[in-house]
């Protein structure tokens, strides 16, 4: 559940993500200054981040749980002299791959028409048991939907 040691992620607000904040119809010059943007704009950005961050956190939680178990096995094989140099790099991405594979398992289409079913399944797997029925709305959020689609359609190696 720690937020630490999360090197898989690169999820900050990129230029493309920030473009809507630069819409001249929504932001006139007096709301900006030469070095950046005001707090009202940061608030808008944070609104868009929440759903994405939550999915990222779920992935990281699963990855950390998997790595704890796998590192135990790694240690035993290391003691036996069968440890190979590429194991670490393999393990780094494995849990995330498994999570994405699990997300799309048994689903032919990638546009997620079964949001509620997915969220219920996520809820059962969530470590701290704090998922509520209100999570059923999260994948209705466009940011979350787009983010998960991106996760599925992008190779892990492309995002590292």
């Amino acid at each position: 559940r720690s937020l630490q040691d999360t090197e898989e992620k690169s999820r900050s607000f990129s230029a493309s993500q920030a473009d809507p904040l630069s819409d001249p119809d929504q932001m006139n010059e007096d709301k900006r200054h030469s070095q950046g943007t005001f707090t009202s704009d940061y608030s808008k950005y944070l609104d868009s981040r929440r759903a994405q961050d939550f999915v990222q956190w779920l992935m990281n939680t699963k990855r950390n749980r998997n790595n704890i178990a796998k590192r135990h096995d790694e240690f035993e094989r290391h003691a036996e002299g069968t440890f190979t140099s590429d194991v670490s790099s393999y393990l780094e991405g494995q849990a995330a791959k498994e999570f994405i594979a699990w997300l799309v398992k048994g689903r032919g289409r990638r546009d997620f028409p079964e949001e509620v079913a997915i969220v219920e399944e996520l809820g059962r797997r969530h470590a701290d048991g704090s998922f509520s029925d209100e999570m059923n709305t999260i994948l209705d959020n466009l940011a979350a939907r787009d983010f998960i689609n991106w996760l599925i359609q992008t190779k892990i190696t492309d995002r590292k």
């Epitope: 937020l3 630490q4 607000f13 944070l46 929440r50 759903a51 999260i138 979350a144």
Partner: antibody, heavy 119, light 112 residues
Framework: QVQLVESGGGVVQPGRSLRLSCVAS????????MHWVRQAPGKGLEWVAV????????FYSDSVKGRFTISRDNSKNTLSLQITGLRAEDTAVYYC????????????WGQGTLVTVSS | DIVMTQSPDSLAVSLGERATINCKSS????????????LAWYQQKPGQPPKLLFY???TRESGVPDRFSGSGSGTDFTLTISSLQAEDVAVYYC????????FGQGTKLEIK
């Protein structure tokens, strides 16, 4: 382990400028948004500014708008804060803070660098 | 901006006793889509930077002793130390991470 080391603080006269730096290690700096948070002597914490992981986007608190500029150099794992038009109320310890997975949440902080504005 | 108000400003508790710090936000920090409250707690010991204890109101950060607990929802939150230890003497801050970050004024915890 994660380390954030600030420098550049000192005593400076009102109206002058100062540049603070923060050198990061122990994590992939380029992947994380970075913040400056300040704390006036004996007072509470105040968020100052944030820069995106690529340095292209920056946000500031209203109290420092137009006077502070946040920047980063990912090739040197360095975060900076350029402060101009210093005021007495800018006197504070300035902390460099790493953002966690969750936006606007700070999981690692530097030890801070003290800026004293005095004539 | 959301205003965070902590109470009390200072607190003296005997070793081994329970310490309770409250935090109130001027508006709700509950995100209904995931039912998470975007409220964090930090501990700051003298001469040190703040240390993250909790996020999402009750999710304990790695390495934080389980005598610490966080609770609350919407606008009212509580940090509880079930059995105060000498090393818990510090100033505690709440922070909302729902929107542009703002902190409470801090609560100084001392030993009685």
């Amino acid at each position: 382990q994660v380390q954030l080391v600030e420098s550049g603080g000192g005593v400076v006269q009102p109206g002058r400028s100062l540049r603070l730096s923060c050198v990061a290690s122990g994590f992939t700096f380029r992947n994380y948004d970075m913040h400056w948070v300040r704390q006036a002597p004996g007072k509470g914490l105040e968020w100052v500014a944030v820069t995106s992981s690529d340095g292209l986007n920056k946000f500031y608190s209203d109290s420092v708008k137009g006077r502070f500029t946040i920047s980063r150099d990912n090739s040197k794992n360095t975060l900076s804060l350029q402060i101009t038009g210093l005021r007495a109320e800018d006197t504070a310890v300035y902390y460099c803070a790493k953002e966690s997975i969750l936006a606007a949440l700070f999981d690692y902080w530097g030890q801070g660098t003290l800026v004293t504005v005095s004539s | 901006d959301i205003v965070m108000t902590q109470s009390p400003d200072s607190l003296a508790v005997s070793l081994g006793e329970r310490a309770t710090i409250n935090c109130k936000s001027s508006q709700s920090v509950l995100y209904s889509s995931n039912n998470k409250n975007y409220l964090a707690w930090y501990q700051q010991k003298p001469g040190q930077p703040p240390k993250l204890l909790f996020y999402w109101a009750s999710t304990r950060e790695s390495g934080v002793p389980d005598r610490f607990s966080g609770s609350g929802s919407g606008t009212d939150f509580t940090l509880t130390i079930s059995s105060l230890q000498a090393e818990d003497v510090a100033v505690y801050y709440c922070q909302q991470h729902y929107t542009t970050p703002t902190f409470g004024q801090g609560t100084k915890l001392e030993i009685k």
